[in-house]
């Protein structure tokens, strides 16, 4: 476990790994006596005091409300539960429990736009009005739309060609169809 925001409570990762390798799996080196291996605390609990001697129990306590540990550990305090960020439109998928962190996600028809590994914004998937879906909206990717004739793609939405200004990129997409198609009025653009 990487204790986020719990500095100074456990040895640095390198030291810890070196010392832990002296003990069998599921045990750790006593904080004050290198020759003693104590049993780690179960997930959902944290370390209150080291085992007094080999074969004696480590004293562990269950994580308080709003905190958790997701695996065996010898943390001196549990980790704070994540709060789903309302300002990023996140919703809680599953609440925090003593042995697992909160799971945050997005509502249906939304995708996750990542700011960092732990922060994302929930954004509405483009519905492709006036177009067809080429690639459906996925967990981290907006819908890719293909616009109907008379519409062009702007910011993932199909916009009428009447909104296309001269010299803009959309002029190419909004050109009237070749003469051969003139007989088919529903195909003609509005530019």
């Amino acid at each position: 476990i990487h204790p986020s925001g719990v500095t100074g409570l456990v040895p640095s990762l390198g030291d810890r790994e070196k010392r832990d390798s002296l003990c069998p799996q599921g045990k750790y080196v006593h904080s004050k006596n290198n020759s003693i291996c104590c049993t780690k605390c179960h997930k959902g609990t944290y370390l209150v005091s080291d085992c007094p001697s080999p074969g004696r129990d480590t004293v562990c306590r269950e994580c308080e409300k709003g905190t958790f540990t997701a695996s065996q550990n010898y943390l001196r305090q549990c980790l704070s539960c994540k709060t789903c960020r309302k300002e990023m439109s996140q919703v809680e998928i599953s609440p925090c429990q003593a042995d697992k962190d909160t799971v945050c996600g997005c509502k249906e028809n939304q995708f996750q736009r990542y700011l960092s590994e732990t922060h994302f914004q929930c954004v509405d998937c483009s519905p492709c009005f006036n177009g067809t879906v080429t690639i459906p909206c996925k967990e981290t990717q907006n819908t890719v739309c293909n616009c109907h004739a008379g519409f062009f793609l702007r910011e993932s939405e199909c916009v009428p060609c009447s909104h296309c200004k001269k010299n803009e990129e959309c002029m190419k997409l909004c050109l009237p169809p070749p003469l051969a198609n003139v007989t088919n009025p529903q195909d003609s653009g509005t530019a």
């Epitope: 996750q112 736009r113 990542y114 914004q121 690639i135 981290t140 990717q141």
Partner: antibody, heavy 113, light 111 residues
Framework: EVQLVESGGGLVQTGKSLELSCEAS????????MNWVRQAPGKGLEWVAY????????YYGDAVKGRFTISRDNAKNLLFLQMNNLKSEDTAMYYC????????WGQGTLVTV | DIVMSQSPSSLAVSAGEKVTIGCKSS????????????LNWYQQKPGQSPKLLIF???TRHIGVPDRFMGSGSGTDFTLTINSVQNEDLADYYC?????????FGAGTKLE
């Protein structure tokens, strides 16, 4: 630790081509939108190009449209910028930047035309 | 294209002072769908790459000291540095991500 490392910059003649690469590590590259941003010597920042996480959405700055191509390889954690028909005004430090909010930045690679 | 006008272009400050940098956009950056302003602020120190300070006009990025504050809505935005420190001497840029092409302000040099 998040790292973005650009490469491929150098001295090139006007009208020639160059491809820049950006290698990402320390984060789930395939989840992130990516951008290229440049900075001419002693000048401000200029956005160059954007590519969405799955490459479905691509946009360019007016100054490079039709000459530059942004692409990515999510399997290899790589971002690319293919630059064709280079002009003297393309001389700049080129940065790749990760996330829609440009939260992660590389140290840049210098392109001199 | 949205034009971003930043002011002042440079500013001489002393440690402990309060600093305000302005950024104006040629059109509103307020997204009606989510009621957020798509305006970011960046800090760039000499010889370094830029660093995200503020997004959504007022949300501080992880690890950014609380002396940095973003405010404003629509077309007028401000970056305030309360009690400026020597390590804050840098160039500051605003960026709109409301619509493509994205555009930066010309920058403000804090010296």
């Amino acid at each position: 630790e998040v790292q973005l490392v650009e490469s491929g910059g150098g001295l090139v003649q006007t009208g020639k081509s160059l491809e820049l690469s950006c290698e990402a590590s320390g984060f789930t590259f395939s989840n992130y939108d990516m951008n290229w941003v440049r900075q001419a010597p002693g000048k401000g920042l200029e956005w160059v190009a954007y590519i969405s996480s799955g490459s479905g959405h691509i946009y360019y700055g007016d100054a490079v449209k039709g000459r530059f191509t942004i692409s990515r390889d999510n399997a290899k954690n790589l971002l690319f910028l293919q630059m064709n028909n280079l002009k003297s005004e393309d001389t700049a430090m080129y940065y790749c930047s990760g996330s829609y909010w440009f939260a992660y930045w590389g140290q840049g690679t210098l392109v001199t035309v | 294209d949205i034009v971003m006008s930043q002011s002042p272009s440079s500013l001489a400050v002393s440690a402990g002072e309060k600093v305000t940098i302005g950024c104006k956009s040629s059109q509103s950056l307020l997204n009606n769908k989510d009621q957020k302003n798509y305006l970011n602020w960046y800090q760039q120190k000499p010889g370094q790459s830029p660093k995200l300070l503020i997004f959504f006009a007022s949300t501080r990025h992880i690890g950014v000291p609380d002396r940095f504050m973003g405010s404003g809505s629509g077309t007028d935005f401000t970056l305030t540095i309360n009690s400026v420190q020597n390590e804050d001497l840098a160039d500051y840029y605003c960026l709109q991500t409301y619509s493509f092409p994205y555009t930066f302000g010309a920058g403000t040099k804090l010296e």
